[in-house]
């Protein structure tokens, strides 16, 4: 069997074949968060479990200090779910009282940091108004998409309010990425 | 063209190259569910269409008796969407009446069963309080993430209430997995 | 190193190996939409950014006239998120007035068009009733799944109401596909 038989007619010579099993991959799961003071319009980053339970990193994809570090340039599928829970939003009361009715909201952002670039890049955002009539509410926001990343890029998940993140179960709040 | 030229410098020798087209894959779609009695705190599993319409299984990924059977160890991306619909939650009425206000909820869980392990493992959970003021409500819960699975593992989708699942369209409620 | 050593025992000879880097891929991001007249029960298609910012198409995956054109048969993962925003639904008022209470809704459909087939195929649908008590609301609908597509198939994203789509940020509303 000649090597040529593995290569479809549109094979680029500069794109070597590689085993799928050695591609950088990570699935991180929620842990209790440290409450943080954060500036207005600057969402705090979540930190993650990277080795216990369902969580793992492999093939040079490393987790450190709230960041997933991209070890190799290429196209990655990146995903996260954050489950939020909270008390009743003041929304309906505000409305009845006739005060300005800006609904509360919950937001998740997957952010890319490139050391050579001064500003972080928001890759994905899920944002939802919360205006519940029940006393306790809970709901997930899910995000996922493909991006071209460079070796050394760092990924993090930011949220609008850390205190509303459900940290209790590894299947409710998670963050992952894999090289395609 | 020598075979060596296909292998990047970090290629592990124990990770053979393989054609993408022969990887285990499945996309299952909703069918009408059989109402089931289930114990408290034990969510019923959905069953699925596996060969008609948009649904398929291929490359030794088989569907049987509500389970997707994993034919080969590796990292899989697993996903599901369940669309729920129902009548008005009692939530707002309960609140007004001053009774304890525990909101209704809808929940989807993707569960892994390993024969050698006594307890199923919850891989992914999407859970949402439902406290609607309109008479009829409907909404999807989407989940997706990557997990390391072993040959022989079984995957299923459990829901909090089968009677609320929208089984009318194959594009509204579905379940899939593919080897990365 | 003989070529045979790259092939696992279940390798099909008709499935050639190919470099991951040359697979068709696209991630499209939102742009301001042109309001369109559309027939009842026929949802308008969104158009997209395909080359600026986070958006790209590569390896013969082309975008033209609201469609992603599939250049090669195979199994694709397809995803989209649409963020909607609007004013208060009339839902609670309708309910109080005792009129028929059909809630407003928001819907996203990922549709496949095959030239040889007269009717488009709905691959994925996310639909949600909207019955908010706050004055302004916003929320995303996310979809993603795997489908077997044929060379020449075209993909588009349809929504129930273009005027409710949040076109302000490329991370809020997007559409992508990649060959597995």
């Amino acid at each position: 069997l000649k090597g040529q038989e593995f290569a479809p007619s549109h094979q680029q010579v500069y794109a070597p074949l590689r085993a799928d099993g050695d591609k950088p991959r990570a699935h991180l799961t929620v842990v209790r968060q440290t409450p943080t003071q954060h500036f207005k319009n600057q969402f705090p980053a979540l930190h993650w479990e990277h080795e216990l339970g369902l969580a793992f990193t492999k093939n040079r994809m490393n987790y450190t200090n709230k960041f997933l570090l991209i070890p190799e340039s290429g196209d990655y599928f990146i995903y996260s779910q954050v489950t939020f829970r909270g008390m009743t939003s003041e929304c309906s009361e505000i409305r009845q009282a006739g005060r300005p009715n800006k609904p509360d909201s919950i937001t998740v952002v997957i952010t890319k940091v490139t050391d050579s670039y001064p500003e972080p890049t928001q890759l994905l955002m899920g944002t939802k108004s919360v205006c519940e009539v029940g006393s306790n509410w809970f709901q997930p926001i899910y995000l996922g998409a493909m991006f071209s990343l460079q070796e050394g890029d760092k990924l993090m998940v930011n949220v609008s309010d850390i205190s509303l993140v459900d940290y209790t179960k590894e299947d409710k709040t998670f963050f992952g990425a894999f090289l395609l | 063209l020598k075979g060596q030229e296909f292998a990047p410098s970090h290629q592990q020798v124990y990770a053979p190259l393989r054609a993408d087209g022969d990887k285990p894959r499945a996309h299952l779609t909703v069918v009408r569910q059989t109402p089931t009695q289930h114990f408290k705190n034990q969510f019923p599993a959905l069953h699925w269409e596996h060969e008609l319409g948009l649904a398929f299984t291929k490359n030794r990924m088989n569907y049987t008796n509500k389970f997707l059977l994993i034919p080969e160890s590796g990292d899989y991306f697993i996903y599901s969407q369940v669309t729920f619909r129902g009548m008005t939650s009692e939530c707002s009425e309960i609140r007004q009446a001053g009774r304890p206000n525990k909101p209704d909820s809808i929940t989807v869980v993707i569960t892994k069963v390993t024969d050698s392990y006594p307890e199923p493992t919850q891989l992914l959970m999407g859970t949402k309080s439902v406290c609607e003021v309109g008479s009829n409500w409907f909404q999807p819960i989407y989940l997706g993430a990557m997990f390391s699975l072993q040959e022989g593992d079984k995957l299923m989708v459990n829901v909090s209430d089968i009677s609320l699942v929208d089984y009318t369209k194959e594009d509204k409620t579905f379940f899939g997995a593919f080897l990365l | 190193l003989k070529g045979q050593e790259f092939a696992p025992s279940h390798q099909q000879v008709y499935a050639p190996l190919r470099a991951d880097g040359d697979k068709p891929r696209a991630h499209l991001t939102v742009v301001r939409q042109t309001p369109t007249q559309h027939f009842k029960n026929q949802f308008p298609a969104l158009h997209w950014e395909h080359e600026l910012g986070l958006a790209f198409t590569k390896n013969r995956m082309n975008y033209t006239n609201k469609f992603l054109l599939i250049p090669e048969s195979g199994d694709y993962f397809i995803y989209s998120q649409v963020t909607f925003r609007g004013m208060t639904s009339e839902c609670s008022e309708i309910r109080q007035a005792g009129r028929p209470n059909k809630p407003d809704s928001i819907t996203v459909v990922i549709t496949k068009v095959t030239d040889s087939y007269p009717e488009p195929t709905q691959l994925l649908m996310g639909t949600k009733s909207v019955c908010e008590v706050g004055s302004n609301w916003f929320q995303p609908i996310y979809l993603g799944a795997m489908f077997s597509l044929q060379e020449g198939d075209k993909l588009m994203v349809n929504v129930s109401d273009i005027s409710l789509v949040d076109y302000t940020k490329e991370d809020k509303t997007f559409f992508g596909a990649f060959l597995l």
């Epitope: 209790r32 829970r85 179960k169 | - | -």
Partner: antibody, heavy 118, light 109 residues
Framework: QEQLQQWGAGLLKPSETLSLTCAVY??????YYWSWIRQPPGKGLEWI?????????NYNPSLKSRVTISVDTSKNQFSLKLSSVTAADTAVYYC????????????WDQGTMVTVSS | DIQMTQSPSSLSASVGDRVTITCRAS??????LNWYQQKPGKAPKLLIY???SLQSGVPSRFSGSGSGTDFTLTISSLQPEDFATYYC???????????FGQGTKLEIK
Amino acid sequence: QEQLQQWGAGLLKPSETLSLTCAVYGGSFSGYYWSWIRQPPGKGLEWIGEINHSGRTNYNPSLKSRVTISVDTSKNQFSLKLSSVTAADTAVYYCARDSGWHFSFDIWDQGTMVTVSS
Amino acid sequence: DIQMTQSPSSLSASVGDRVTITCRASQSISSYLNWYQQKPGKAPKLLIYVASSLQSGVPSRFSGSGSGTDFTLTISSLQPEDFATYYCQQSYSNPQECSFGQGTKLEIK
């Protein structure tokens, strides 16, 4: 309704290792963090540390060098070991469940009195 | 370390009285404050979490308020079963930990 029940030695000599185990009955184990808290006679409450279903731990910095908390998910149990005990470790030891709202402990066991005396 | 100071350390009141116990943190803890009731020989019981949320099953005469550094627990109308020791507890610390106030003993006048 979930219940917690603990057991372990109630009388120790200085320099020995305190060992307690707490079992969770009648509910979910995986969805919570599980803590140990102690209360010396006539004094206030002191949080010792916690563990979750996966085995991730957080400890009170003042006790961290002597504390190990572990989990056995197959039995729905978690355990406390406190090494090199002294008379200052004499206390009622409680196991408790974090409700999911940042160290708000909604279920407690009845407590075990542990005395350290030579 | 964040220090929690409760006041008063003890107080006497009568059935039907309105009682307020305060808790002050040495630095801002946002709303990360819980209140517990403990009776002699018993485990503590959670009353209020996240500063103002009433735990399920706790009578509505108990309420909590405050954010930042100053918090209060109020019992609107004392009942005989309310005589006990009350503890506040913060959960804002970094590294992740929690700490309790020294307690307020509520006695019958």
